[in-house]
């Protein structure tokens, strides 16, 4: 197993590791045959360099002390496995006015301060989002707030005192929603035990639909850390997150579409899942659509992906083209697809681990190529690779943190493409950043939908 | 109309291997829980394995972990559940059903398939 | 561990009458309990969910109530339909079941 001996670890902290990883990684135990060694050390050194990828670890792919100590940090039950910041397929609440329900009482506070803790961290939400709570004290609530102890009717057990503090569940009928508090811990106002409101804002996090954050700053990262309550605030990361999910606070805000129809174009909040040149046209990828946008012309126009691309799925969260070659790349979950003079090739899809990402690397947020360099940029998390296109390799010293090397831009972007020779175009939620590469800075800050004559 | 249709059942001896499939469609596959539960010949209902919208995480009853192990392929919507060192207690009607959506598992199982009967017996 | 035990494992009614199956967990589980509906040959059908919310397309006659650890299920007056067997369940633990006959 992948044991740095200089730390001489012992058995049990192999046993707590795998334990972990399961929980939260997917590593599967009953795939870790004794008989083979080798095989069940390379995938519990995936797990941990996929682990320490995500927390903002060194990645080493060892159980090493800051690893073991991140392992036993107080955190959230929900798993990381799926590096999403909303989570899979998007679970929302398909409504502006949600309910919550105080199903009983931890002993360890006073009932006014739990209920105060709990309405301070809708509240949280609330303010950054077109969402209201209200508490009810009868009836069938969309989010029951319950503190329980062990097993507790559901999936997943609570472990004692420390290791996983709470869970939730994200938005749905039934246990949709609801958030579980363990009540092994000590519950508090303040910075002893375990802070309530701050876990608080994190379960209800995942109650609206979030994920867990890899920005040691977002509220919604998975393991837990004291912060000053008074003058605690969501980092951007968070309100990004969210208001991908349901807008900011302007009334009668447009709320995402079950049935995937098509976007509003002129919405403020729209966000994009991929943006590209492809010659002298920008396209801008949302959900099952794409819009088409002729370089210096107002009018723009909206197609199905389908319906140009007939074997290339919806949702394409990255693309990039190398204009030289007429050749685009699209890419969904670990998957990539290579048009070529706008038509598909064939024997794709092909994996994104072609390109050289490590096995932890699930997805890839936004691409870029940068023709003066020849160098394509990946952007990945809250990190960038660098890919050279001649030779066909990631170039050495990556990955590298968006926010050192991007100066204002960051932790994670949604989409990015180049233009006009010296200019990357961020996306970020429903903003962009025009980023001079040259200067290396940020140069406009404009809405996502500029190019659209909003 | 939400579908899942089993198939891969049959007779097996004792010690032997089986993979079941589930065909999925009428819904977004990728989005969903997807869970195993099993009924032996006149007994009552037993959960078996349950995995993540993204495959990345899986559960299994204690009776089986080891033995059984669960997978999606969402480009193909369809769940397996691949049987290695089955007993006489494995046999059953094996059911695929839908759970929620999100990173945990709800075990609220809100349709079934018809079900796919294996048959462990030398 | 969490054991959920209903009651009674068989029963005998006419069309028209009022039938209650009770579910008790040996530890509370809040809220977190369904009732699922098994007819002969098929595969189960959620019935109640969260303890007394009606499944979409089952009909009023089906109600659910409890929390905590006593929960029961309802059928105010039966149908020809409605003998089959009902299991209770929350997360990965099923009752054993209550078959429900013809008088």
């Known amino acids: 197993l992948p044991l740095n001996s200089s730390t001489s670890l012992e058995k049990n902290n192999v046993l707590f590791g795998e334990r972990y990883l399961e929980k939260f990684y997917g590593l599967e135990i009953n795939k870790l045959p004794v008989t083979k060694m080798k095989y069940s050390g390379n995938l519990m050194k995936e797990k941990i360099q996929e682990m320490q990828h995500f927390l903002g670890l060194k990645v080493t792919g060892q159980l090493d002390t800051s690893t073991l100590e991140m392992m036993h940090a107080p955190r959230c039950g929900v798993p990381d496995v799926h590096h999403f910041r909303e989570m899979p397929g998007g679970p929302v609440w398909r409504k502006h006015y949600i309910t919550y329900r105080i199903n009983n009482y931890t002993p360890d506070m006073n009932r006014e301060d739990v209920d105060y803790a709990i309405r301070k961290a809708f509240q949280v939400w609330s303010n950054v989002t077109p969402l209201k709570f209200s508490k009810i004290n009868t009836g069938m609530a969309d989010i029951l707030v319950v503190f329980a102890r062990g097993a507790h009717g559901d999936f997943h057990a609570f472990d004692g005192k420390g290791g996983i503090l709470a869970h939730a569940f994200g938005p749905g009928s039934g246990i949709g929603g609801d958030a579980h508090f363990d009540e092994d811990e000590f519950w508090t106002t303040h910075s002893g035990g375990t802070n309530l409101f701050l876990t608080a804002v994190h379960e209800i996090g995942h109650s609206l639909g979030l994920g867990h954050s890899s920005d040691p700053k977002a509220v919604m990262f998975p393991t837990y850390k004291y912060v000053d309550i008074n003058t605690f605030r969501l980092s951007a990361d968070d309100i990004r997150g969210i208001q991908s999910l349901y807008g900011d606070p302007k009334e009668n805000q447009r709320l995402p579409n079950p049935d995937n129809s098509e976007p509003a174009l002129c919405d403020p909040n729209l966000s994009f899942d991929a943006v590209t040149t492809v010659g002298n046209k920008i396209f801008f990828f949302k959900d099952r659509f794409f819009w088409l946008k002729v370089s210096e012309r107002p009018k723009t126009s909206v197609n199905l992906i389908s319906s140009l691309w007939p074997t290339l799925p919806s949702g394409i969260e990255a693309a990039y083209e190398i204009e030289a070659r007429n050749q685009v790349f699209l890419f969904k979950d670990d998957k990539y697809w290579l048009i070529s003079n706008l038509r598909p090739e064939p024997n794709y899809p092909k994996s994104i681990h072609s390109f050289g990402f490590p096995n932890f690397v699930k997805k890839i947020d936004a691409a870029v190529f940068n023709p003066r360099f020849y160098r394509t940029y990946f952007f990945v998390d809250n990190q960038y690779w660098r890919y050279d296109e001649r030779r066909q390799m990631m170039d050495p010293g990556y990955p590298k943190l968006i926010t050192k090397n991007f100066q204002g831009i960051g932790p994670k972007i949604d989409a990015v493409f180049y233009s006009k020779n010296k200019y990357y175009y961020f996306f970020q939620g429903s903003n962009q950043f025009e980023y001079d590469f040259l200067l290396q800075r940020i140069t406009k800050t404009l809405k996502s939908n500029s190019w659209f004559g909003c | 109309e939400v579908q899942l249709l089993e198939s891969g059942g049959g007779l097996v001896q004792p010690g032997g291997s089986l993979r079941l499939s589930c065909a999925a469609s009428?819904?977004?596959?990728?989005?969903?829980?997807m869970q195993w539960v099993r009924q032996a010949p006149g007994k009552g209902l037993e959960w078996v394995s349950g995995?993540?919208?993204?495959?990345?995480?899986?559960m299994y009853a204690d009776s089986v972990k080891g033995r059984f192990t669960i997978s999606r392929d969402n480009s193909k919507n369809t769940l397996y559940l691949q049987m290695n060192s089955l007993r006489a207690e494995d046999t059953a009607v094996y059911y695929c059903?839908?759970?929620?959506?999100?990173?945990?598992?709800?075990?609220?199982?809100?349709?079934w398939g018809r079900g796919t009967l294996v048959t462990v017996s030398s | 561990d969490i054991q959920m035990t209903q009651s009674p494992s068989s029963l005998s009614a006419s069309v028209g009458d009022r039938v209650t199956i009770t579910c008790r967990a040996n530890?509370?589980?809040?809220?977190?309990l369904n009732w699922y509906q098994q007819k002969p040959g098929k595969a189960p059908e959620l019935l109640i969910y969260?303890?007394?919310s009606l499944q979409s397309g089952v009909p009023s006659r089906f109600s659910g109530s409890g929390s905590g650890t006593d929960f029961t299920l309802t059928i105010s007056s039966l149908q020809p339909e409605d003998f089959a067997t009902y299991y209770c369940?929350?997360?990965?633990?099923f009752g054993q079941g209550t078959k429900l006959e013809i008088k």
């Open positions: 059903a839908r759970d929620i959506m999100g990173a945990y598992a709800s075990g609220l199982f809100h349709n």
């Open positions: 009428g819904f977004t596959f990728s989005h969903y829980w």
């Open positions: 995995i993540v919208p993204s495959g990345g995480l899986t």
């Open positions: 530890q509370s589980i809040y809220t977190y």
């Open positions: 969260a303890a007394s």
């Open positions: 369940q929350q997360a990965g633990i």
